[in-house]
Interface confidence: medium
């Protein structure tokens, strides 16, 4: 059987089965998701579940630019430092810079400190570039 | 292919009303914002109207808010505009256009980007 | 809000246009550019700033940083010759630019 490659919408570019949208256009982070939802096909605001997803979307946007932090769909709804990814997918793998994880941060953003390897948390209303996942 | 056809353009007196269609095909409409733009003679494009996907959502430029209504029959696939109280200044070519992408839900985070354009209707509003 | 853009641009065959759009903090926008030749209907030929529909030449390409995008057609074609328009999505309406008419001499 010959097996198609799903194909993802214009712009956005394709690994694993997933198709990812990088975004950069300033956005607090639930305007953010708000957009990432706009697009349909049940799309998010990226969930990140392994290190080989992480250097795969590291790669992509470090083509673009390498110093701005960029939102992903991991968020701390409750102010408790219970994470959870917008998109419901489970909270395994993680990727903290071991900055700090306290005050007033309950979004999290890939840090362009390590080549968008590692996390960081950020006040939410903080506007920035974002990252969009969906599965086609 | 994707396809949009406008009708319904015509001579219309100051005053009179005009209803135009745009019958689309070959994409699953209920799932795109459409609007309409139009263009006066030897003049730029002006955005006119726009709905979302569901019909749940309209918006419209400031020159026609009162007079024009946009709606939208996802069972007969097409898309509508009716124009009341027309004035001269609004003869031109109306083109019913598809969003870039599909967006639900269409509102807040999102924004509207007129992708694939129909041929485009005449109205001439003229006593 | 408003887009302004310059009426016309001359290039000679094989030349870069460079066709501008400024708007109040432009760079928050997202910038569409669309080509509309007489007697047609407008094509979209760059989305989100400086994306670009797989029909349309790669010697299309768009930018935007600032209060200005810019709309870019390197070794420009007789075919170029048209209007451009950028558009952008601001508080419920789209707007569009008054165009520009590019000549190709």
């Known amino acids: 059987d010959i097996i198609m490659r799903p194909s993802c919408a214009p712009g956005w570019f394709y690994h694993k089965s997933n198709c990812y949208g990088y975004f950069r256009k300033l956005r607090n982070w639930s305007d953010a998701e708000l957009e990432c939802q706009s697009y349909g096909n049940g799309a998010h605001l990226a969930s990140i579940l392994s290190l080989k997803e992480a250097s795969t979307i590291a790669e992509y946007i470090s083509g673009y630019q390498r110093s701005q932090p960029i939102w992903i769909g991991l968020h701390d709804p409750q102010k408790r430092q219970q994470w959870q990814w917008i998109d419901g997918a489970m909270y395994l793998y993680r990727s903290w810079s071991g900055k700090s994880m306290g005050g007033n941060k309950h979004c999290a953003e890939m840090s362009s400190n390590n080549n968008f390897l590692t996390w960081s948390s950020n006040e939410c209303n903080k506007r920035q570039h974002f990252l969009c996942k969906y599965r086609p | 292919e994707v396809q949009l056809l406008e009708s319904g353009g015509g001579l219309v007196q100051p005053g009179g009303s005009l209803r135009l269609s745009c019958a689309a095909s070959?994409?699953?409409?209920?799932?795109?914002?459409m609007s309409w733009v139009r263009q006066a003679p030897g003049k730029g494009l002006e955005w006119v109207s726009a709905?979302?996907?569901?019909?749940?959502?309209?918006y419209y430029a400031d020159s026609v808010k009162g007079r024009f209504t946009i709606s939208r029959d996802n069972s007969k696939n097409t898309l509508y505009l009716q124009m009341n109280s027309l004035r001269a200044e609004d003869t031109a070519v109306y083109y019913c256009?598809?969003?870039?992408?599909?967006?639900?839900?269409f509102g807040s985070g999102s924004y509207l980007n007129p992708f694939d354009w129909g041929q485009g209707t005449m109205v001439t509003v003229s006593s | 809000y408003e887009l302004t853009q310059p009426p016309s641009v001359s290039v000679s065959p094989g030349q870069t246009a460079s066709i501008t759009c400024t708007g109040d903090k432009l760079a928050e926008k997202y910038v569409s550019w669309y080509q509309q030749k007489t007697g047609r209907s407008p094509v979209l030929v760059i989305y989100?700033?400086?994306r670009r529909p797989s029909e349309i030449p790669e010697r299309f390409s768009g930018s935007n940083s600032g209060n200005t995008a810019t709309l870019t057609v390197s070794g420009a074609q007789s075919m170029d010759e048209a209007d451009y328009y950028c558009q952008v999505w601001d508080s419920n309406t789209v707007i569009f630019g008054g165009g520009t008419k590019v000549t190709v001499l």
């Open positions: 070959g994409f699953t409409f209920s799932s795109y914002a």
């Open positions: 709905i979302s996907g569901s019909g749940g959502s309209t």
């Open positions: 256009a598809r969003d870039r992408v599909r967006r639900v839900p």
């Open positions: 989100q700033d400086d």
